[in-house]
Each structure stands twice: as structure tokens, then as C-alpha cells.
């Protein structure tokens, strides 16, 4: 029951996390800054991975994609790649984990197969979460670096004086969404990996057979052995018997046609 709960909770947490990663990737508010200020109006700027928007205090808003823009930071492509890889891995992980859920029966799928699928999806969620966290962190670092690099400098260009205006950059909402979502996906992945340990088959039963030496009154009974998967230990040291094997309580055993192999 605890395994099912851990697996189910891991799935739900990862699902929320991946939805958050998708939302963060699509959001425009990765960074925000004030572009222009005067007593009548202020122009705010918010930028995403795919487009940049300006919003004025008057209510005017305009967004523009980066499609034809040259001179974008190379790191932006890296961030885009990390977020997309995170989404793809997360989506595949979700697909795999649906079939791995203990509460869902698909044909005659064995627990060992479900355990493997749970582990696979868990690893995918962990990598997905790390990709998102890395992507958001790289972007945040890029913002801080660019801010300090663009100190107010004056130089002469073809169109006359060009001044880099010092404006205050702030981290946009998407960064926080990305960090939280990445963390949730990571936690969900860890929970799936933990659930995998409990899902792995505990034991394999081998039939124990009583062997009898003719003319003796006491039978030799080999102990039933429990094959360990490495995930669980045979703490009770119980013996497993099956078929025509005698019980442990019997002192004497009489030959029968079932006792000989």
C-alpha cells in the first residue's frame, strides 16, 4: 500500500512539475525591466525565451518574437534547449510511469517489469527536473552578467551619440515557476525511484522436496530457499514448501510415489 502511495504521489508531483516546466518555458516574464520613465507614462519590458513585450502604464502592450533578431545571447539557445529537453524527457517519463502505476493493470505485466518502468520514469523525471533547474539558473546568471557588463557607457556610432541606459533588471515570474517546477519534478523522480524498490519482486518460490533414505525413520528435509532480489532480506528465515512436500512439524515421513524424483 505504501509503495502504491509513494508511486502515485511521485507521479502526481512529477506531473505538476512538468506542467510547471511547460508553463515556464512558454511564459514571457523571464526577465522584467523599466525601459522608459517620464511623469506621464512608464514603459515596462518583459522578456521570455521566444518573444519580448513592452507594456506602458497607459495600457498599451506589444509583443514581438525574436525570429529575425541577430545578436541574441548564445546562452539563450542553451536555455531553450535545456527547457525543451526537460519537457521531452518529462513527457516520456509521464507516459512510461502511467503504464508502471501499480493501480493500473495492463495485461499480464509482471511486477518486475513495472519496477523497471518505475525506475526508468523516475530517472527521466530527475534528469528533466535538473534540466529545468539548470536552464533557469543559466538564464538568471545571464541576466546578472549582462546587467553588470552594460554599465552606462558612451560611444559614438554612425547615428551619433549612443548611450547605454542603466535600467534595473528583475527576475521574472517564469524563473521562480521554473525553479519550483524543476524541484517538484526532481522530487517526483526520487519518489518514483523509491517506489521502484518496493515494487521489485520480493521473492521467488522454489519447490522444496523431501528426500528419504530407505530404511530410515527420519526424513532429510532440505530447507526452503528464498531467492533474494537484493531489495529485500529474508528476515524471518521462513521455509517455503509446495506440492507434496511434508510440513516442518512432521517428525516421521512415510514413502510415497511423490517423494522420489
Amino acid at each position: 500500500m505504501a509503495v502504491t502511495a509513494c508511486q502515485g504521489l511521485g507521479f502526481v508531483v512529477s506531473l505538476i512539475g512538468i506542467a510547471g516546466i511547460i508553463a515556464a518555458t512558454c511564459m514571457d516574464q523571464w526577465s522584467t525591466q523599466d525601459l522608459y520613465n517620464n511623469p506621464v507614462t512608464a514603459v515596462f519590458n518583459y522578456q521570455g525565451l521566444w518573444r519580448s513585450c513592452v507594456r506602458e502604464s497607459s495600457g498599451f502592450t506589444e509583443c514581438r518574437g525574436y525570429f529575425t533578431l541577430l545578436g541574441l545571447p548564445a546562452m539563450l539557445q542553451a536555455v531553450r534547449a535545456l527547457m525543451i529537453v526537460g519537457i521531452v524527457l518529462g513527457a516520456i517519463g509521464l507516459l512510461v510511469s502511467i503504464f508502471a502505476l501499480k493501480c493500473i493493470r495492463i495485461g499480464s505485466m509482471e511486477d518486475s517489469a513495472k519496477a523497471n518502468m518505475t525506475l526508468t520514469s523516475g530517472i527521466m523525471f530527475i534528469v528533466s527536473g535538473l534540466c529545468a533547474i539548470a536552464g533557469v539558473s543559466v538564464f538568471a546568471n545571464m541576466l546578472v552578467t549582462n546587467f553588470w557588463m552594460s554599465t552606462a557607457n558612451m560611444y559614438t556610432g554612425m547615428g551619433g551619440m549612443v548611450q547605454t541606459v542603466q535600467t534595473r533588471y528583475t527576475f521574472g515570474a517564469a524563473l521562480f515557476v521554473g525553479w519550483v517546477a524543476g524541484g517538484l519534478t526532481l522530487i517526483g523522480g526520487v519518489m518514483m525511484c523509491i517506489a521502484c524498490r518496493g515494487l521489485a519482486p520480493e521473492e521467488t518460490n522454489y519447490k522444496a522436496v523431501s528426500y528419504h533414505a530407505s530404511g530410515h525413520s527420519v526424513a532429510y528435509k532440505p530447507g526452503g530457499f528464498k531467492a533474494s532480489t537484493g531489495f529485500g532480506s529474508n528476515t524471518k528465515n521462513k521455509k517455503i514448501y509446495d506440492g507434496g512436500a511434508r510440513t516442518e512439524d512432521e517428525v516421521q515421513s512415510y514413502p510415497s510415489k511423490h517423494d522420489y524424483v
Partner: nanobody, 120 residues
Framework: EVQLVESGGGLVQPGGSLRLSCAAS????????MGWYRQAPGKGRELVAT???????YYADSMKGRSTISRDNAKNTVYLQMNSLKPEDTAVYYC??????????????WGQGTLVTVSS
């Protein structure tokens, strides 16, 4: 890089009118605001009027009621219509453009200036 071409300056009599225009060209992402500043002989540069991409305009007290700023977003051009000019309006008028640079600080570009002389 952004190139600014200013025109419309010249000699005008007191009480007269003048229309300045400034066209921005070159490779840039988006112009956020355009405006006009002026610098009279021996004085500092002061704002005349400015207009944002959304059309919100702001005027210096000295030019309020006597000037109108407008812009054509499609042509990346800003116009300043000045009426009832006074001798104290004599100055070099500079075009100013603020350009958005994604993920970097915005840039302010300045024109070379056009001289407006108000004299009888």
C-alpha cells in the same frame, strides 16, 4: 546600429511655425520611445517632447500648448510641430530614440542635431 536623419530646422520669424522630423533606420529590435531635446548656446540639453510606442506623449513646460509631437511606428519616424515660436526657442534640436535590446540594457541613440533659429 541605428542611423537618425533629422530635418526641418532653419530660420523662422517669431510667432512662426516649424515642423521637425526624425527618421530612424538600421537594424534594431524595437523603438520604445522617440523624442526631441534641445540645447541653447551656453546651456545644457533639455527635453522638449517625447512620445512612447503606444502614443503617450510628454511635453516640457516651456513648450506645452505650443508644440505637438507625433510618430509613425511603421516608418520609425517622429515629428515635432512647433507653433508660436519665440527667440528663446533658438537652439540645436536633437532627436532621441530609445531602442530595446533584448536581454541587455536599452540604448539611447542621438541625432547630429538640427539648428532652429528664431529671429526677425
Amino acid at each position: 546600429e541605428v542611423q537618425l536623419v533629422e530635418s526641418g530646422g532653419g530660420l523662422v520669424q517669431p510667432g512662426g511655425s516649424l515642423r521637425l522630423s526624425c527618421a530612424a533606420s538600421g537594424s534594431f529590435f524595437r523603438i520604445v520611445a522617440m523624442g526631441w531635446y534641445r540645447q541653447a548656446p551656453g546651456k545644457g540639453r533639455e527635453l522638449v517632447a517625447t512620445i512612447t510606442r503606444g502614443g503617450s506623449s510628454y511635453y516640457a513646460d516651456s513648450m506645452k500648448g505650443r508644440s505637438t509631437i507625433s510618430r509613425d511606428n511603421a516608418k520609425n519616424t517622429v515629428y515635432l510641430q512647433m507653433n508660436s515660436l519665440k527667440p528663446e526657442d533658438t537652439a540645436v534640436y536633437y532627436c532621441n530614440v530609445r531602442v530595446e535590446v533584448p536581454f541587455f540594457q536599452p540604448n539611447d541613440y542621438w541625432g547630429q542635431g538640427t539648428l532652429v533659429t528664431v529671429s526677425s
